[in-house]
């Protein structure tokens, strides 16, 4: 039994930590091998995470990790029964994937402006609740050339719009994504989208 | 809003025994590692005891054998508890939330050791 | 046990001047370990900088701190008001643990 492809590691700079790789055959991998790891800090111990399979040779664990800060790093054993498969360390600082945010709501009863809201995924006391950005995506159900992404670059999690630069009549849905440049993340998930009929008065054409 | 709320200080005998706590809220206590640290009358920062999330340990050789640290998740609190005090035990007494270094303080709890 | 000196003992300065305290440990320390805080009297510590250089949230930008090894610097570059109390430097080591250096109070001239 060997590794394939080493384990790669992604954190969400929280609590959880992603870890892939693959076999080079088939495997169970939840009976076959265990994943250890440990953060390099004087009050530490080990852990264990049994993987979950991910295509027939692929691996996954989802390691649940201390509160993180940027100067961690976890070292982390590959074992299959008593053979060290791999051995390797990990900085979740330089691998980060934010957590989606959440809670996402269209405000349509603002006078023909459209308020978008979500909700940021980390507590305050995260280092990356004040340095998330974010993109949201709004597309018509019935046009799939109507597709739009719009840059929130500034902190608060919400977004105006004029109901006019939409079309009048039809369902739009909406999604939003984030990232934190602080870091170099890559983006997160998107957030469940969510939908409304978006309506708004014609101003009167003069002649 | 992170919050860490010391008591159980005051005036003890040389030889005596204290309990301190920590109350601990607005994070979540059982993914960080918590310390206590002092600081005697008029002088600098000492560190005295960490406690791991796993309940692994450490102390300052001054209170070894002496003090011992302890939490409860379930309460969020954490705890010191101070056996066989010298009159150099006294000292402001903060509990911190950090790793390799503290960004969270209490505004501590005093400790006097004075027959 | 790595032992943290700090330099000088006081500072005298007037408000508006440049404030450069030092820090020397008796044994390298990873950058990564090295911190520094800020104590008014009466007042819990209060976190300025971690990993040898960068700034803890909310702290303001004259606060810097820099170096590697043994020798580490808090530098503030235009003193406030605020900004006259006692700073002390701190490092972690991974078989040692946790110790802080003696202090360097920054008073007003």
């Known amino acids: 039994m060997k590794v394939l492809q080493e384990p790669t590691c992604v954190s969400d700079y929280m609590s959880i930590s992603t870890c892939e790789w693959k076999m080079n055959g088939p495997t169970n991998c939840s009976t076959e091998l265990r994943l250890l790891y440990q953060l390099v800090f004087l009050l530490s111990e080990a852990h264990t995470c049994i993987p979950e399979n991910n295509g027939g040779a692929g691996c996954v664990c989802h390691l649940l990790m201390d509160d993180v800060v940027s100067a961690d790093n976890y070292t982390l054993d590959l074992w299959a029964g008593q053979q060290l498969l791999w051995k390797g360390s990990f900085k979740p600082s330089e691998h980060v994937k934010p957590r989606a945010p959440g809670n996402l709501t269209v405000h349509t009863n603002v006078s023909d402006t459209l308020l978008l809201t979500w909700s940021n995924p980390y507590p305050p006391d995260n280092y990356l609740y004040n340095h998330l950005t974010y993109a949201v995506n709004i597309w018509s159900e019935n046009d799939p050339a109507d597709f739009r992404i719009y840059n929130v670059t500034y902190l608060e999690p919400s977004l105006r719009i004029a109901a006019s630069t939409l079309k009048s009549g039809i369902s739009y849905r909406a999604r939003v994504r984030a990232w934190a440049q602080c870091y170099n993340t890559t983006w997160s998930e998107w957030s469940p989208s969510t939908k409304w009929h978006n309506s708004y008065r014609e101003p009167f054409e003069q002649h | 809003e992170v919050q860490l709320v010391e008591s159980g200080g005051g005036l003890v005998q040389p030889g005596g025994s204290l309990r301190l706590s920590c109350a601990a809220s607005?994070?979540?206590?059982?993914?960080?590692?918590m310390f206590w640290v002092r600081q005697a009358p008029g002088k600098g920062l000492e560190w005295v005891s960490g406690i791991g999330t796993g309940g692994a340990t450490s102390y300052a050789d001054s209170v070894k054998g002496r003090f011992t640290i302890s939490r409860d998740n379930a309460k969020n609190s954490l705890y010191l508890q101070m056996n066989s005090l010298r009159a150099e035990d006294t000292a402001v007494y903060y509990c911190a939330r950090g790793r390799y270094y503290f960004p969270w303080w209490g505004q501590g709890t005093l400790v006097t050791v004075s027959s | 046990e790595i032992v943290l000196t700090q330099s000088p003992g006081t500072l005298s300065l007037s408000p508006g001047e440049r404030a450069t305290l030092s820090c020397r440990a008796s044994?390298?320390?990873?950058?990564?370990?090295l911190a520094w805080y800020q104590q008014k009297p009466g007042q819990a510590p209060r976190l300025l900088i971690y990993?040898?250089?960068s700034r803890a949230p909310g702290i303001p930008d004259r606060f810097s701190g820099s170096g590697s090894g043994t020798d580490f610097t808090l530098t503030i570059s235009r003193l406030e008001p605020e900004d006259f109390a006692v700073y002390y430097c701190?490092?972690?080591?991974?078989?040692?643990?946790?110790?802080f250096g003696q202090g360097t109070k920054v008073e007003i001239k």
């Open positions: 607005g994070f979540t206590f059982s993914r960080n590692a």
């Open positions: 044994q390298s320390v990873s950058n990564s370990y």
């Open positions: 701190q490092q972690y080591d991974h078989s040692a643990g946790w110790t």
């Open positions: 990993g040898a250089s």
